[in-house]
């Protein structure tokens, strides 16, 4: 099965869920997810869709700074000289270190041993002030196209 | 167990606010969407928006815009809708769901506005 | 925004019966549309994600199928308790949208 439509999708932004049928067993699902132990085919569906909403997010938040850099520059430098483009850059790599952290989280780390390196070279880089630029590279050429699309496809053979 | 739990109803008066809560619990609240879906008497379901603890994301359904405020406590895992200047057409049923699908419904708060 | 039409309103039928409700969407859906069952005076319940994918728990009666602007939920044998009102939502695009509901009466 094919991956859904990813980049026609990538327009929109999602969320939706619903209620179980009373079915026990499913009430344990989130407490043995987390803890490793189980993850039925809807969780699976879910970290596909959230990884999904996780890239185009981080794209949104690059392409806003981005234009609001090109029109309002001198706005934008702050009184510190490059708070704002700063904070930006640190919350993307907050976002992005706690998501690949989530997506390990119960798998191991020796899943993904070359994503949980580079969040966390990045996240020792962001005081060098070469975090920006590595971190745009890395979601733009790694996170977007292979992990992303690595992780999902991998998933939706997974649940067959 | 998974639960999201919501006041059982509320009486407001026309033009009045009310804030209603969706307190979640048995689960990793910062790892997933929280919807808002309201349900009129007799009538079927609208989305009104959501929320991701996580990234701070909050989405508005136009239609509900200038009516709703969502907010977010993680403290206290708790979601906020709040409905302003009350109309007789904010009478509805207000369900709190968790991501894409609504897998988990809340009990939904009863909103009547009347005077 | 993606508007969801679902046919038709209200049906009644027997139990043991087959049922096919369907929801057409204004626009591709691709296949993130869900299907939800709600009772009198209860919240709704997730049946089918994914356009059709059960979810967990859901007697496997149920079947979903469809993709882009077609989507079935089909009842292979009614049973009175599934005496309920159905929903399709699509979450492929802001803002997620609903139809109108199908009500499934027994004769």
């Known amino acids: 099965r094919s991956l859904q439509d990813t980049e026609e999708k990538s327009r929109s932004f999602s969320a939706s869920q619903a209620d179980p049928l009373s079915d026990p067993d499913q009430m344990n699902e989130d407490k043995r997810h987390s803890q490793g132990t189980f993850t039925s085919d809807y969780s699976k569906y879910l970290d596909s869709r959230r990884a999904q909403d996780f890239v185009q997010w981080l794209m949104n938040t690059k392409r806003n700074r981005n234009n609001i850099a090109k029109r309002h520059d001198e706005f934008e430098r702050h009184a510190e000289g490059t708070f704002t483009s700063d904070v930006s850059s640190y919350l993307e790599g907050q976002a992005a270190k706690e998501f690949i952290a989530w997506l390990v989280k119960g798998r191991g780390r020796r899943d993904f041993p070359e994503e949980v390196a580079i969040v966390e070279e990045l996240g020792r880089r962001h005081a060098d002030g070469s975090f920006s630029d590595e971190m745009n590279t890395i979601l733009d050429n790694l996170a977007a196209r292979d992990f992303i699309n690595w992780l999902i496809q991998t998933k939706i053979t997974d649940r067959k | 167990q998974v639960q999201l739990l919501q006041p059982g109803a509320e009486l407001v008066k026309p033009g009045a606010s009310v804030k209603l809560s969706c307190k979640a619990s048995?689960?990793?609240?910062?790892?997933?969407?929280l919807n808002w879906v309201k349900q009129r008497p007799g009538q079927g379901l609208e989305w009104i928006g959501n929320a991701y603890p996580g990234w701070g994301i909050i989405n508005y359904n136009e239609k509900f815009k200038s009516k709703v405020t969502l907010t977010v406590d993680t403290s206290s895992s708790t979601v906020y809708m709040q409905l302003s200047s009350l109309t007789s057409d904010d009478s509805a049923v207000y369900y709190c769901?968790?991501?894409?699908?609504?897998?988990?419904w809340g009990q939904g708060t009863t909103v009547t506005v009347s005077s | 925004n993606i508007v969801m039409t679902q046919s038709p309103k209200s049906m009644s039928m027997s139990v043991g019966e087959r049922v096919t409700l369907t929801c057409k969407a204004s626009e591709n859906a691709g296949t993130y549309v869900a299907w939800y069952q709600q009772k009198p005076e209860q919240s709704p319940k997730l049946l089918i994600y994914n356009g059709s994918h059960r979810y967990d728990g859901v007697p496997d009666r149920f079947t979903g199928s469809g993709s882009a602007t077609d989507f079935t939920l089909t009842i292979s044998s009614v049973q009175a308790e599934d005496l309920a009102d159905y929903y399709c939502?699509?979450?492929?695009?802001?803002?997620?949208?609903f139809g109108g509901g199908t009500k499934l009466e027994m004769k």
């Open positions: 769901a968790r991501d894409y699908d609504n897998a988990y």
């Open positions: 048995g689960y990793n609240f910062n790892d997933y969407w």
């Open positions: 939502g699509q979450s492929y695009s802001y803002p997620w949208t």
